[in-house]
Amino acid sequence: APVSSHCRLDKSNFQQPYITNRTFMLAKEASSADNNTDVRLIGEKLFRGVSMSERCYLMKQVLNFTLEEVLLPQSDRFQPYMQEVVPFLARLSNSLSTCHIEGDDLHIQKNVQKLKDTVKKLGESGEIKAIGELDLLFMSLRNACI
C-alpha cells in the first residue's frame, strides 16, 4: 500500500474553541440555505477503498478543492464567518503542503473527482452544500490527520 509522509496536523489546530465555533456556525448557516439534503459530499463513498494511512492525503485534496473552488468564489457570502474561517483552513492546507503518498494514488483521485463532479454538477447549490459540510470537513480532517 502507498506510504504517506508528512500527512499530520497538530492536535492544537483543532483545540481552538473560537475558530471551531466559527467554522461550525458557517456550516450551519450555509446548510440552512441548502435545499438538496439527499446528497452528502463527505461520506462513505469518498473514503471507500482508502486505507487508514491514506485518509489524510485524501482530506488534503478535499480541503484544497474546497478552498480554491468553493470558498473563494463564495467569499462575499456568509460573513463575518467566511473571513475568519478561510484563513484558518488555508493555514491547515499550508501545513499539509508536504503531505504526499508514495505510489499510486489513482483510487484516491477517483474518489475526490466524484466529489468535485457532484459540486460542479449542482452549480452554486453544490458550493453552498460544500460550505454546509465544513463541519464534516473540519472533523474529518481532524480524525484523518492528527
Partner: antibody, heavy 119, light 112 residues
Framework: EVQLVESGGGLVQPGGSLRLSCAVS????????MIWVRQAPGKGLEWIGI???????YYASWAKGRFTISRDNSKNTVYLQMNSLRAEDTAVYYC?????????????WGQGTLVTVSS | AVQLTQSPSSLSASVGDRVTITCQAS??????LAWYQQKPGKAPKLLIY???TLASGVPSRFSGSGSGTDFTLTISSLQPEDFATYYC??????????????FGGGTKVEIK
C-alpha cells in the same frame, strides 16, 4: 444484500486455541476495514481489534499477543485467531464492517458466534 | 483511554413515552460518537453517527445530540420494537491505536 456470517465458535478448554471466520457477501471486502467485537454473557460490547484494507492491524491493549486478525479478500473472509484462551474470553464474538465516513462507524454486524472456554 | 458512562443503566417506560439516554465521555471526543441498538440474541444495529446523524433506514423518532463530553439519545415516542439495549461508542484519534474505539456500558429499555 450485505451479509456477514461468523463461524468457528464452540467449546474450548482453557489454554486452547480457536480460529473464528467472518464470511462476507454483498460488498467488496477489499474496500473496507473490518473489526471484531465481543460480548460476554449479560455484559456490554468490547472492541477487540481492526484490520485495515491493506492488512495493517490494531488491537485493544488487552488483546495484543493472544489475538490475531487476518483477511483473505479472495475468499471474502476475515479471521480471528485466539490463543491461550481463558474462562473470561467466553463471549459472543461479532465481526462488523468499518464504514469510515470521516469517523469510523460499524455497520452492519454479523449475527455472532459463541465461544465458551471451560474445562 | 476514554471512558464512556451511560445513564441510566436501565429504565422502564411505556409505549408512547419520550425516552432520553445520556452518554458522558471522560475527555473531549468532539462529535465522534455513535449509538447502537441491540435486541436480545441479536447483533447491534447502527442508529446514529456524528452524534446526531441518523443512519439509513432508522425511524425519525430517534435523535441524537451533543458534542465534547455530553451526549444524548432521545426516542420521541417509544414503540414496541424499541425495547432493547442501547450503546454509545466513541472513536478517538491521535492517541494510541489500542484505545481507538470504546463502548459505553449500555442502557436497557424495558417495558413498564
Amino acid at each position: 444484500e450485505v451479509q456477514l456470517v461468523e463461524s468457528g465458535g464452540g467449546l474450548v478448554q482453557p489454554g486452547g486455541s480457536l480460529r473464528l471466520s467472518c464470511a462476507v457477501s454483498g460488498f467488496s471486502l477489499s474496500s473496507y476495514a473490518m473489526i471484531w467485537v465481543r460480548q460476554a454473557p449479560g455484559k456490554g460490547l468490547e472492541w477487540i481489534g481492526i484490520i485495515d484494507i491493506e492488512g495493517s492491524t490494531y488491537y485493544a491493549s488487552w488483546a495484543k499477543g493472544r489475538f490475531t486478525i487476518s483477511r483473505d479478500n479472495s475468499k471474502n473472509t476475515v479471521y480471528l485467531q485466539m490463543n491461550s484462551l481463558r474462562a473470561e474470553d467466553t463471549a459472543v464474538y461479532y465481526c462488523a464492517r468499518d464504514r469510515f465516513v470521516g469517523v469510523d462507524i460499524f455497520d452492519p454486524w454479523g449475527q455472532g458466534t459463541l465461544v465458551t472456554v471451560s474445562s | 483511554a476514554v471512558q464512556l458512562t451511560q445513564s441510566p443503566s436501565s429504565l422502564s417506560a411505556s409505549v408512547g413515552d419520550r425516552v432520553t439516554i445520556t452518554c458522558q465521555a471522560s475527555e473531549d471526543i468532539y462529535t465522534n460518537l455513535a449509538w447502537y441498538q441491540q435486541k436480545p440474541g441479536k447483533a447491534p444495529k447502527l442508529l446514529i453517527y456524528w452524534a446526531s446523524t441518523l443512519a439509513s433506514g432508522v425511524p425519525s423518532r430517534f435523535s441524537g445530540s451533543g458534542s465534547g463530553t455530553d451526549f444524548t439519545l432521545t426516542i420521541s415516542s417509544l414503540q414496541p420494537e424499541d425495547f432493547a439495549t442501547y450503546y454509545c461508542q466513541a472513536s478517538v484519534y491521535g492517541n494510541a491505536a489500542d484505545s481507538r474505539y470504546t463502548f459505553g456500558g449500555g442502557t436497557k429499555v424495558e417495558i413498564k
